[in-house]
């Protein structure tokens, strides 16, 4: 029996035609029988010679699938056929093709395809109305879309597109379209305007042109310090390397491949070399100050400070700061020194002209003066005199001077200058520290003393005007403290019963009287405070006769002058008035009666100073002197 | 016979208010000054505040100064101790008294419980 | 810290006497004022002044002064004795002032 051919296989498919190959079977046999369906269902047959191991079906239909059987053939015999199924390749197509306007001398095709492995397009482009100017550009494969520059300002174009793929042609594809007007430039503006550089900015639309022509020129020598061709696609272009402070000439042209149009001009003027101004030296403060100054507003790389002791140029330190600084904080310097601080600024290279300024920092922060005022039995207040606005807080200990009590502290705000210190026990003796607190300084502590008073005292019992029949009892106390105060009145023997007044608590002083002549008495005053009694004041005296007062000379002669006095409030029978010289001598008398406040001393030497005491008599009583001098004329 | 009645005590929170009044009977109301006292929970006595007798003057311990209001109508009879911001360190049995023009304090009321908790 | 000092508990034998003593700056001023209180009840003014006993108070308690010291002085103490005794004077503000207190216990 006859082998089948081995191994039939379809080794290529296009679009009309296919490609077979196989293996010859190990049996002999005369020929091959090759016999393949058409799409309309018949059979076409094709004999081969024994030696053949491949095949091409030819004039096939694209898109098409084949049913291939392969027998081998020996006289009448005939192998089992080897059978294959297989389709050919679609026909390559070419679809929507569009065509639109790429700016004013160009167009843009887009079109669509089928995935296949189209080698090339080719695309043919011919003004409508002049068939002669046709332009073929073949554009590879894999695109689907491309750009025709160069063509004519405002013109109809034909386009034709047809493709090439495993050397089918698809069919032409065509359209026509045509090119926009000739396009303007905008205008030209110019930007960030430095003092070497500058950014020229314009306006065009997109895909005009080629590239832009830039020419600039010094205004007043018009002398052309630059040319530059840039991109079509640039709207904008920094222009460096200019002088400072000089009147520049721009101008701008939109270049295309045949076209240039007309030059758009501008005029600019560079700024002034930087430099800085406003050096200015704020917030001196003992150990650092704060440095401002200004610039014009341009990106500075960064300042260098250089900081030196005006009498010391070794001790200098630098500084760097960014270029987006117009102060900064020197710290770190010595107290009540003067400071030579300069800076420059560095720009693109460039280094300012340097700024300097003279400074002196503060003396360092000193507390002083601490004193106490307002004290009370369970306060007091204290004032200081200290730096002003350097102080972040002032410590204030409060010690008692036996060290019984346990030692305040108080925290005050360092704008303070005055602190109230309340809750303190009267009668008690203090020491008072105070110092103060800077961010990186305590000060040396100063101290005071300060006592508080004593509890509302009554105070200073006299007893005065003592004459026979009473007296006058006064104290002091304190404003406003008692509400009452009880006088006791006692005779020292105790024969009688003790009198008791009551006085409002305003008042200070109460006069006895119808009490016995020449007897002691004592006296108690105590004051009441919201039903509260003080101990009482003790005070002692005897009735007696009231002294004369206020001894008054008057109408001095040579050997004569009148003696006034004031009588006691008591009724008395007789005054004695005793004169005698100041050197020694007899001393003379005169007697007048009670009701006189006044007599006439006679018989004097010239020009002699006397000494004259007066006492006041009634029955065998005297009262105390009263005295006085005078000198005859 | 000198009779004093506090009322008004009770449990308020942190921060709340309470009025104590103390009615009193027997003497001449107008005449004398009053003071409030009060006694914390197994603690002694403080003085919290005074008026006098008109109710012109009026004095307060440290601790309640700003917080507390003393006062007196003369023509109900009645003391008041308007309390504003309590906390919980008023808690305390609140005692009204009497003081003479000599003598301190000689009668007491028998005290209103004042308790200050969240 | 209170402005009148007092020992916080003093004990006696019944029948002995005992001397309750406070100590404070306002005493070298004023006479101090006494009060009893017994558990649940309010005070009770025992002493005022230089050694004065409001009408009811039995003649037992009496009152005494020395410098910053004022003494409360019970002779012969009673059961009915047993309380918490309290000083009081008055500072220069006007302000009442209390001691601490003292538990007296009458054994």
């Known amino acids: 029996e006859l082998d089948t051919p081995k191994d039939l296989q379809v080794s290529e498919t296009a679009e009309t035609s296919l490609t077979l190959l196989w293996k010859t079977p190990l049996a002999k046999f005369d020929r091959y029988r090759l016999n393949y369906s058409l799409p309309t269902g018949q059979w076409v047959g094709v004999q081969l010679p024994r030696n053949t191991t491949s095949y091409v079906l030819r004039g096939l239909e694209p898109g098409q699938e084949y049913n291939v059987l392969l027998t081998a053939e020996k006289g009448r015999h005939k192998s089992k056929p080897a059978r294959v199924k297989a389709s050919t390749e679609e026909v390559p197509s070419l679809e929507n093709l569009t065509v639109t306007e790429a700016g004013w001398d160009g167009l843009r095709l887009n079109w669509t395809a089928d995935d296949l492995a189209y080698e090339y397009f080719v695309i043919q482009v011919q003004e409508a109305n002049n068939v002669e100017t046709a332009h073929n550009f073949t554009v590879p494969g894999n695109l689907r879309a491309a750009d025709i520059p160069g063509l004519k300002v405002a013109t109809s174009y034909r386009v034709s597109i047809y493709g090439v793929a495993r050397g089918y042609r698809t069919p032409v594809l065509s359209a026509e379209t045509s090119t926009g007007t000739t396009p303007n430039l905008g205008e030209v503006t110019v930007a960030e305007v430095g003092w070497d550089a500058l950014t020229l900015n314009w306006t065009a639309p997109e895909g005009a042109y080629k590239n832009f022509f830039i020419q600039v020129l010094e205004a007043d020598t018009t002398q052309t310090v630059q040319n530059l061709t840039v991109p079509g696609g640039l709207r904008s272009v920094d222009l460096p390397g200019l002088k400072a402070a000089t009147r520049y000439y721009i101008t701008l042209r939109g270049v295309t491949q045949d076209f240039g149009t007309a030059p758009l001009s501008v005029e600019v003027l560079t700024e002034d070399l930087p430099q800085l101004g406003g050096l200015s030296v704020t917030e001196v403060s003992w150990d650092g100050l704060t440095l401002n100054w200004t610039t014009d507003d341009l990106a500075y790389k960064h300042f260098v400070v250089q900081v030196q002791e005006a009498n010391n140029v070794e001790a200098a330190q630098n500084l760097t700061v960014p270029g987006s600084l117009r102060a900064v904080d020197i710290p770190g310097l010595k107290a009540d020194t003067p400071y030579r601080v300069s800076i420059y600024g560095v720009i693109q290279g460039y280094r300012t002209p340097m700024l300097s300024t003279d400074v002196s920092t503060a003396r360092e922060p000193e507390i002083g003066n601490l004193n106490v005022s307002d004290v009370t039995p369970k306060s007091f207040n204290l004032s200081w005199t200290a730096t002003d606005g350097i102080f972040d807080m002032f410590t204030i200990e409060i010690i008692d001077s036996n060290r019984l009590l346990q030692t305040a502290e108080h925290n005050i705000s360092g704008a303070e200058r005055t602190a109230h210190i309340s809750g303190l026990p009267p009668s008690t003796d203090f020491i008072v520290y105070l110092s103060g607190i800077a961010p990186s300084i305590r000060t040396k502590t100063i101290s005071t003393t300060a006592t508080t008073e004593a509890l509302p005292l009554l105070e200073n019992l006299t007893i005065s005007d003592t004459n026979p029949y009473g007296f006058t009892v006064s104290w002091t106390a304190s404003e406003n403290a008692f509400d009452s105060f009880l006088v006791t009145v006692v005779d020292s023997g105790k024969l009688l019963d003790p009198q008791e007044f009551t006085l409002s608590g305003t008042q200070r002083k109460l006069e006895l009287r119808g009490l016995i002549t020449g007897i002691g008495y004592e006296v108690l005053v105590s004051g009441f405070t919201q039903g509260h009694q003080t101990k009482p004041l003790r005070a002692e005296t005897i009735t007696a006769m009231g002294s004369p007062k206020e001894v008054i000379f008057s109408d001095i002669t040579e050997n004569s002058a009148t003696v006034s006095w004031r009588a006691p409030t008591a009724q008395v029978e007789s005054f004695r008035i005793t004169y005698v010289p100041i050197t020694g001598g007899t001393p003379s008398m005169v007697t007048v009666d009670g009701t006189k406040t006044q007599t006439r001393l006679v018989k004097l030497i010239p020009g002699v100073e006397y000494l004259v005491s007066i006492i006041a008599m009634k029955g065998f009583e005297e009262s105390e002197p009263v005295s006085g001098s005078f000198t005859t004329a | 016979e000198v009779q004093l009645l506090e009322s008004g005590g009770g449990l308020v929170q942190p921060g709340g208010s309470l009025r104590l009044s103390c009615a009193a009977s027997?003497?001449?109301?107008?005449?004398?000054?009053m003071s409030w006292v009060r006694q914390a929970p197994g603690k002694g006595l403080e003085w919290v505040s005074a008026i006098s007798g008109s109710g012109g003057s009026t004095y307060y311990a440290d601790s309640v100064k700003g917080r507390f209001t003393i006062s007196k109508d003369n023509s109900k009879n009645t003391l008041y101790l308007q309390m504003n911001s309590l906390r919980a360190e008023d808690t305390a049995v609140y005692y009204c008294?009497?003081?003479?023009?000599?003598?301190?304090?000689?009668?007491w009321g028998q005290g209103t419980l004042v308790t200050v908790s969240s | 810290s209170s402005e009148l000092t007092q020992d916080p508990a003093v004990s006696v034998a019944l029948g002995q006497t005992v001397r309750v003593t406070c100590q404070g700056d306002s005493l070298r001023s004023y006479y101090a004022s006494w009060y009893q209180q017994k558990p649940g009840q309010a005070p009770v003014l025992v002493i005022y002044?230089?050694?004065n006993r409001p009408s009811g108070i039995p003649d037992r308690f009496s009152g005494s002064s020395s410098g910053n010291t004022a003494s409360l002085t019970i002779t012969g103490a009673q059961a009915e004795d047993e309380a918490d005794y309290y000083c009081n004077s008055i500072n220069s503000t006007r302000n009442e002032v209390f001691g601490g207190g003292t538990k007296l216990t009458v054994l």
């Open positions: 027997g003497f001449t109301f107008s005449s004398y000054a």
């Open positions: 002044g230089k050694n």
């Open positions: 008294a009497k003081t003479s023009p000599r003598v301190p304090l000689d009668y």
